[in-house]
């Protein structure tokens, strides 16, 4: 056969699926790759075929499109499986092709299994919600295009292996659940089981999300340094290991990138012709609220060393902030038979 | 095909307990939750409890909550309701019923329980 | 626990009549509402879950209404094999209860 694009294996496009529910898959091609969408394809003449590869096998079969029930069909650019069987697992790919063109991609699927808490192999998104924040709402995902307007769903909401029922703060909306005030408590996954009929057969689609209860806007301030502050000096004698940590706490912020770093006299260390280095550790709070560490490090300081300015540096989307260490060169000891009996005028 | 297929009738004497099984075929057992409904002789159906087999919980009407257990055996596939301290009113058709999404679209054949003294 | 009342407790009718039987909450149930038919016997049967929707293959004659605490199911031509025992159930908060069941018989 003629040349054709190849776009290879879209890994990036990592399908999961449950077993015995239905999903719809569009072809990648027109989302990630071609600079044209289903509709101006077919009006061009160009026709989107689909086959697979089963998983552990290499020999790419075509789609059979002529079960029972219809079990899978295409409809546009549209991979339906009403529902899915855990055999379906494997590599699927669409081309786009007529006489004089050819672009195809392939992409995999996995078929999963659940269990009756929900628990399976799947990815789970993430959703923040404010801690102490108001009333707030989570939206059952991906159901959209399983179902025309005029079906009227059941939706059942879950908090890990529990119905929400007579939750005091949690309530369920038909495709939405509303937290009326969310805590640390409400941490776990919640699962919303939609439940429609089409053509005279009845489908289920699940749906699990993770809600993360962060730090509220509210509440949030500009970063702060904890370390260096106006109680600790850095008193070193030259040849000694000087370590001054940069302690800095960032609020949680939607989005927002926090940033620390260090200043040696107004220079990135990497500008400063000395042996610095800086080790980062970073950990975090029950509502996600950040503390950053940088220990900047000079294994063996110098008397020039010790006379720079050292500042720490933090920024976040409430501000930026600085602070400078207070070094100094310790004075030796004083040696008594000199110094002190200097001290005390003797002759 | 999926399948729920429950014991055999049973005849005890009040104050006795019984225990009735519910064996599933045809699906991945701990995908699912099994509930327990009874029928008295002539009259509506009621609701006794359910079983999610993953994570072992059950909940119960509290009109039986100190006399049943409901659990589920994984390696078998098998749901069990066990009606202690029996009496006359407790006899009824038992049945189990799968469900998920809040469907019970599947049903035992059900088990006649005739407590007589 | 939610009470469902429902009516009549039985009816008679013939092949053709368009039957109606309701369902109501104590309390508000939402759309939470499942239809159960029963023949002698035997279990019971899924037609109507989430209040309007008919489960697999349950014959368009049967149709379910209704939301928060009335509901209502309609047999809209009766058929020979519908003579049994239909059962409202709320699946809405535990415990889960039915109505007591309504008995249509052949007139």
């Known amino acids: 056969s003629e040349r054709c694009d190849d776009w290879g294996l879209d890994t990036m496009r990592q399908i999961q699926v449950f077993e015995d529910e239905p999903a719809r898959i569009k072809c990648p091609l027109f989302e990630h790759f071609l600079k044209f969408n289903y509709s101006t394809a077919h009006s061009a003449g160009l026709t989107l075929i689909w086959y697979w590869t089963r998983q552990d096998r290499d020999l790419e079969e075509p789609i059979n499109f002529r079960l029972p029930e219809n079990r899978i069909s295409k409809e546009k650019d549209v991979l339906w499986f009403r529902p899915t069987l855990l055999n379906d697992t494997g590599n699927y790919t669409c081309m786009l092709r007529n006489t004089t063109y050819c672009s195809k991609v392939a992409f995999p699927l996995e078929v999963v299994q659940k269990d009756s808490c929900f628990n399976s192999p799947m990815k789970l998104p993430v959703h923040k919600l404010y801690i102490e924040y108001g009333i707030q709402r989570i939206t059952c995902p991906n159901v959209d295009g399983y179902f025309p307007s005029s079906v009227k769903p059941t939706i059942t909401w879950y908090m890990g292996c529990y119905k929400i029922q007579n939750f005091n703060n949690v309530i369920p909306e038909g495709m939405n659940l509303s937290f009326l005030i969310a805590f640390i408590s409400n941490n776990g996954n919640y699962t919303c089981v939609v439940t429609y009929p089409e053509n005279g057969r009845t489908f289920h689609l699940t749906r699990t999300l993770t809600v993360k209860v962060v730090g509220s806007p509210k509440n949030a301030v500009p970063p702060v340094i904890h370390s260096p502050n106006d109680h600790v000096v850095y008193e070193k004698e030259p040849g000694e290991e000087l370590l001054i940590p940069c302690t800095v706490y960032f609020s949680f912020l939607m989005d927002s990138r926090n940033e620390v770093w260090w200043t040696i006299d107004g220079k990135k260390p990497d500008d400063i012709p000395i042996d610095v280095t800086i080790n980062e550790s970073i950990s975090h709070s029950r509502t996600e609220d950040e503390t950053r560490t940088q220990i900047l490090s000079i294994k063996k300081v110098t008397s020039e060393d010790l006379k720079r300015s050292y500042v720490c540096h933090a920024r976040s989307a409430k501000g930026e902030v600085a602070k400078a260490a207070t070094v100094k060169q310790k004075v030796p000891a004083p040696r008594y038979t000199v110094e002190l009996a200097c001290g005390f005028g003797a002759t | 095909e999926v399948q729920l297929v429950q014991s055999g009738a049973e005849v005890k004497k009040p104050g006795s307990s019984v225990k009735v099984s519910c064996k599933a075929s045809?699906?991945?057992?701990?995908?699912?939750?099994i509930h327990w409904v009874r029928q008295a002789p002539g009259q509506g159906l009621e609701w006794m409890g359910y079983n999610n087999p993953t994570s072992g919980y059950s909940e119960y009407n509290q009109k039986f909550t100190d006399r049943v257990t409901i659990t589920a055996d994984k390696s078998t596939s098998t749901a069990y309701m066990e009606l202690s301290s029996l009496r006359s009113e407790d006899t009824a058709v038992y049945y189990c019923?799968?469900?998920?999404?809040?469907?019970?679209?599947?049903w035992g054949q059900g088990t006649l329980v005739t407590v007589s003294s | 626990a939610i009470q469902m009342t429902q009516s009549p407790s039985s009816l008679s009718a013939s092949v053709g009549d368009r039957v109606t039987i309701t369902c109501k909450a104590s309390e508000n149930v939402g759309y939470s509402v499942s239809w159960f038919q029963q023949k002698p016997g035997k279990s019971p049967k899924l037609l109507i879950y989430g209040a309007s929707n008919r489960y697999t293959g349950v014959p368009s004659r049967f149709s379910g209404s209704g939301s928060a605490t009335d509901f209502t199911l309609t047999i809209s031509s009766l058929q020979p094999e519908d003579f049994a025992t239909y059962h409202c159930g709320q699946i809405y908060i535990y415990p889960y209860t039915f109505g007591g069941g309504t008995k249509v018989e052949i007139k």
């Open positions: 019923a799968r469900e998920y999404g809040d469907l019970f679209a599947y």
């Open positions: 045809g699906y991945t057992f701990n995908s699912y939750w």
